[in-house]
Amino acid sequence: RGVFRRDAHKSEVAHRFKDLGEENFKALVLIAFAQYLQQCPFEDHVKLVNEVTEFAKTCVADESAENCDKSLHTLFGDKLCTVATLRETYGEMADCCAKQEPERNECFLQHKDDNPNLPRLVRPEVDVMCTAFHDNEETFLKKYLYEIARRHPYFYAPELLFFAKRYKAAFTECCQAADKAACLLPKLDELRDEGKASSAKQRLKCASLQKFGERAFKAWAVARLSQRFPKAEFAEVSKLVTDLTKVHTECCHGDLLECADDRADLAKYICENQDSISSKLKECCEKPLLEKSHCIAEVENDEMPADLPSLAADFVESKDVCKNYAEAKDVFLGMFLYEYARRHPDYSVVLLLRLAKTYETTLEKCCAAADPHECYAKVFDEFKPLVEEPQNLIKQNCELFEQLGEYKFQNALLVRYTKKVPQVSTPTLVEVSRNLGKVGSKCCKHPEAKRMPCAEDYLSVVLNQLCVLHEKTPVSDRVTKCCTESLVNRRPCFSALEVDETYVPKEFNAETFTFHADICTLSEKERQIKKQTALVELVKHKPKATKEQLKAVMDDFAAFVEKCCKADDKETCFAEEGKKLVAASQAALGL
């Protein structure tokens, strides 16, 4: 019952141009090109997009025109391969152009870089931005799409259109305001933070599809949609899962036009059938397309239906469990996951998937046993420790967060994770641990019933960042093991890691701990990152350092920065006091 049963079109490019309209077509092609060729200058991409757009218009006018029958991958790939500096800029990626479709597109996908060597985006003065916006609004917004897409090569393209719409609205409103900065800067901060979160969430979806396959993604979607739409029946949830899987497969595969088109169709279907899906969709469905799709994706869980009987009758107590499992495996397990998830909005999706996997493993074992019913009769008892583990972990970490506050909680995680996987690069450890630490302010404020889905599913997203960054330059077998063995057990795998006893401490390098007056002009966030970078390096030098030792050194460091930033001759202070600090720290840590 998919919503995407379309007639074949003579010209795919004409079909998508007509469906999406010129503005969205151009934006999506720009995103696609920027996500593939992340180093190309903006002007080059705009030129390519304009050429593709002009070609699409000829196909709209006459679908039988030359090359109009070619696939989008062929058309776009041919266009990308015309870039003159491909070999110099991208090295072996240029070899992709020697391949035929579909191998060529697969080759481009494999060369997407999650951590491209691009300068950090620096925000210009508000007046400068407003002038640029008014001078050429179209170019200004295209530049936004380009800069985000090239830094986030898996960003969910239709959602990026929504961000761009909000970006435009912010400038339209705030550049006319009396206090432009007060109006604009909080909006841009919000868009930046939401954008990073959106990128990370989508990256996990793509990793799930690409590394663990469609079945893994579908299982995730069944669990999540069953929690969100507990009144929807199984056939409805299954249909939504099929369609959602198609949308995300397309976007993760670089098929952004199809993805955006199919996402719009899915939103339309959901709104036309909201009576049989969820009572929470009414407001979403009154919004324009981009807002509607975003709203549906974020909609709160519907209330659980009344009169749900115990699951034990059908899935444990029945003597026919093995017959049902053997004769209809996927439906039976899918139904189990659906029924369990709709009853448990208080569980994380990854926990629900662990329970489903445990159930499946038990049936595989027990249905081959002499007395299957006796064997699987206690399967629900096996769930108890699986449920209690994340509950206890979240309780402990929320207590620690409430005691320490976000910055110090991040520091505790920095130490914890550096000791677990000290081979990982310092910038990655800082970025990942800072994000792990944000779970506190994001989730600990919630009541018990919402903590686990908030915390553990967020941690899955953050740990996936570690996994994709580590995959680019693997340095730790332990990280590789936790990242590749099981998608749903990544967090427990990392939690279970102890201090890496095989690690040989890093040589002491005074330069790592030398600071200059420029630290004083940094924002509070940037200053924290500097201090946290030093903390990771300390642990790498002295992995056996105690909490107390590290705390003492960090307190001294904070005092040193504060003192020198108040000094008249800051640079001299940093040079002289810095030497003393390094010596004192070495003594304190026994280096």
Epitope: F234, A235, E236, S276, A313, S318
Partner: antibody, heavy 120, light 108 residues
Framework: EVQLVESGGGRVQPGGSLRLSCAAS????????MNWVRQAPGKCLEWIGH???????YYATWAKGRFTISRDNSKNTLYLQMNSLRAEDTATYFC??????????????WGQGTQVTVSS | AFELTQSPSSLSASVGDRVTITCRAS??????LAWYQQKPGQPPKLLIY???DLTSGVPSRFSGSGSGTDFTLTISSLQPEDFATYYC??????????FGCGTKLTVL
């Protein structure tokens, strides 16, 4: 509106056959275990069998062989094929929806029933 | 397959009375028992499931208890609309189900 409507009942001679239908509206049959239950005049409720979400049919011991349950998901309709009918098969036949895809009970949703009379 | 024995098979009572109907299974069915009310010319209506869970919309004067083999349906204060036939149903032990033979509740 969520409902079940049975049809196909009537008078049939002993030894004859009859196919009852149960049309579902407001929900998808394929999501549930769908049951047939009968009730002879002034008598107990008697479960005949069901077909679950995995398309596996189960029957009461007495119904095996003579009765067959099937469904057509595209028509959202459940069927009961009854062969070699006897006088004691005279009853009102209900279709009823299980709580889930593999549930044997409870039945919250019932049709109004269709009357089958077996007599010469 | 297990059998369900309902008792009494018929019962007369007055409005305001407290009424108890029992259902005994020939083997343990844990808590997998439902109670239905049926009036002439109508299909059964689900009152209680999983032995003691009240179906939404059913008045709270109806309650169920028991587990294993012995189960009870109680109507705490009989109302005029409660005169009907009541059935128990056991389910969940396999992919088959069984109904009790009913208790006809009439006006005294």
């Amino acid at each position: 509106e969520v409902q079940l409507v049975e049809s196909g009942g009537g008078r049939v001679q002993p030894g004859g056959s009859l196919r009852l239908s149960c049309a579902a509206s407001g929900f998808s049959l394929s999501s549930y275990a769908m049951n047939w239950v009968r009730q002879a005049p002034g008598k107990c409720l008697e479960w005949i069998g069901h077909i679950n979400a995995g398309d596996i049919a189960y029957y009461a011991t007495w119904a095996k062989g003579r009765f067959t349950i099937s469904r057509d998901n595209s028509k959202n309709t459940l069927y009961l094929q009854m062969n070699s009918l006897r006088a004691e098969d005279t009853a009102t036949y209900f279709c009823a929806r299980g709580a889930g895809g593999f549930s044997t009970g409870p039945f919250k949703l019932w049709g109004q029933g269709t009357q089958v009379t077996v007599s010469s | 397959a297990f059998e369900l024995t309902q008792s009494p098979s018929s019962l007369s009572a007055s409005v305001g009375d407290r009424v108890t109907i029992t259902c005994r299974a020939s083997e343990s069915i844990n808590s997998r028992l439902a109670w239905y009310q049926q009036k002439p010319g109508q299909p059964p209506k689900l009152l209680i499931y999983d032995a003691s869970d009240l179906t939404s919309g059913v008045p709270s004067r109806f309650s169920g208890s028991g587990s294993g083999t012995d189960f009870t349906l109680t109507i705490s204060s009989l109302q005029p609309e409660d005169f009907a036939t009541y059935y128990c149903q056991g389910y969940g032990g396999s992919s088959t189900t069984t109904f009790g033979c009913g208790t006809k509740l009439t006006v005294l």
